[in-house]
Interface confidence: medium
Amino acid sequence: QFLKEGQLAAGTCEIVTLDRDSSQPRRTIARQTVKCSCFPGQIAGTTRARPACVDARIIKTKQWCDMLPCLEGEGCDLLINRSGWTCTQPGGRIKTTTVS
């Protein structure tokens, strides 16, 4: 299977842009755009804190924790109105991700 330049193999993802804003103390805001070429019924998402192709039904229902977006050992919770999710580390530190 030969791919054109810039074309992704099915089932694969790449990070297109990654911007970091560390202007606020003790808080880093990262904005990431991911491009994926997914199998049928899948869509770009996040699994185990990495870009991945996920079940499209998860995106439709906004049940973000169903992507398993957090690292092993963390806990996942939906944000209010399903705008994203939080990953809580064993030490209590919380990483919040919003979807746009």
């Epitope: 991945a52 192709c53 169903d66 398993l68 963390e74």
Partner: antibody
Framework: QSLEESGGRLVTPGTPLTLTCTAS????????MGWVRQAPGEGLEWIGI?????STYYASWAKGRFTISKTSTTVDLKMTSLTTEDTATYFC???????????????????WGQGTLVTVSS | ELDMTQTPPSLSASVGETVRIRCLAS??????ISWYQQKPGKPPTLLIY???NLESGVPPRFSGSGSGTDYTLTIGGVQAEDAATYYC??????????FGAGTNVEIK
């Protein structure tokens, strides 16, 4: 990290039964969980899965008769209209997603309980 | 309904031989296959996931290959402790996921 099934026993046909899988050492909010059964001397048979959110999917033969639900630390398998064909060891398994280098995502049943025996006999 | 045809049902091998177990899916499962080893009276343990990824802690003599509908588990240089039943689990979506019937491996 461990899983332990309980609730298996001898029941008569038609009796409902609920099996419980208790998870220790990890958060159920960050994994899928599945149930698998194995009749004596036979192979493994997939029953169904529960997502982190509580969404469920079942094997076609299990729909309607088997129900999977969960709390923060346990996963239940509720079985109704049991027949002698349902005699088996029932396993719960943790289902993680392994992500490859480029975003390939695959499920891994990476942690299993020891199983609980359900015997259906008149 | 997905069907996973696993062959052979049983085999006998001598220590050091290479053993191959095949699973054929009734439809393309996009490498959505994992392989498990089960010993009598014990739960299964994961060997390979995503067709070819070796689970951590599993000896490198175990390997997986294949794509589309055709997948193989290979044990290169089989050892006495590899005597067990091996199962493939295939499926592309959770509403259609199935175990193969199993292969019983006996070591002579």
């Amino acid at each position: 990290q461990s899983l332990e099934e309980s609730g298996g026993r001898l029941v008569t046909p038609g009796t409902p039964l609920t099996l419980t899988c208790t998870a220790s050492g990890f958060s159920l909010s960050n994994y899928y969980m599945g149930w698998v059964r194995q009749a004596p001397g036979e192979g493994l048979e997939w029953i169904g899965i529960i997502y982190a959110s509580g969404s469920t999917y079942y094997a076609s033969w299990a729909k309607g008769r088997f129900t999977i639900s969960k709390t923060s630390t346990t996963v239940d398998l509720k079985m109704t209209s049991l027949t002698t064909e349902d005699t088996a060891t029932y396993f719960c398994a943790r289902i993680d997603i392994g992500v490859g280098d480029y975003g390939w995502a695959y499920d891994r049943l990476d942690l299993w309980g020891q199983g609980t025996l359900v015997t259906v006999s008149s | 309904e997905l069907d996973m045809t696993q062959t052979p049902p049983s085999l006998s091998a001598s220590v050091g031989e290479t053993v191959r177990i095949r699973c054929l899916a009734s439809e393309d499962i996009y490498s959505g296959i994992s392989w498990y080893q089960q010993k009598p009276g014990k739960p299964p343990t994961l060997l390979i996931y995503g067709a070819s990824n070796l689970e951590s802690g599993v000896p490198p003599r175990f390997s997986g290959s294949g794509s589309g509908t055709d997948y193989t588990l290979t044990i290169g240089g089989v050892q006495a402790e590899d005597a067990a039943t091996y199962y493939c689990l295939g499926g592309y979506s959770y509403s259609s996921i199935t175990f193969g019937a199993g292969t019983n491996v006996e070591i002579k």
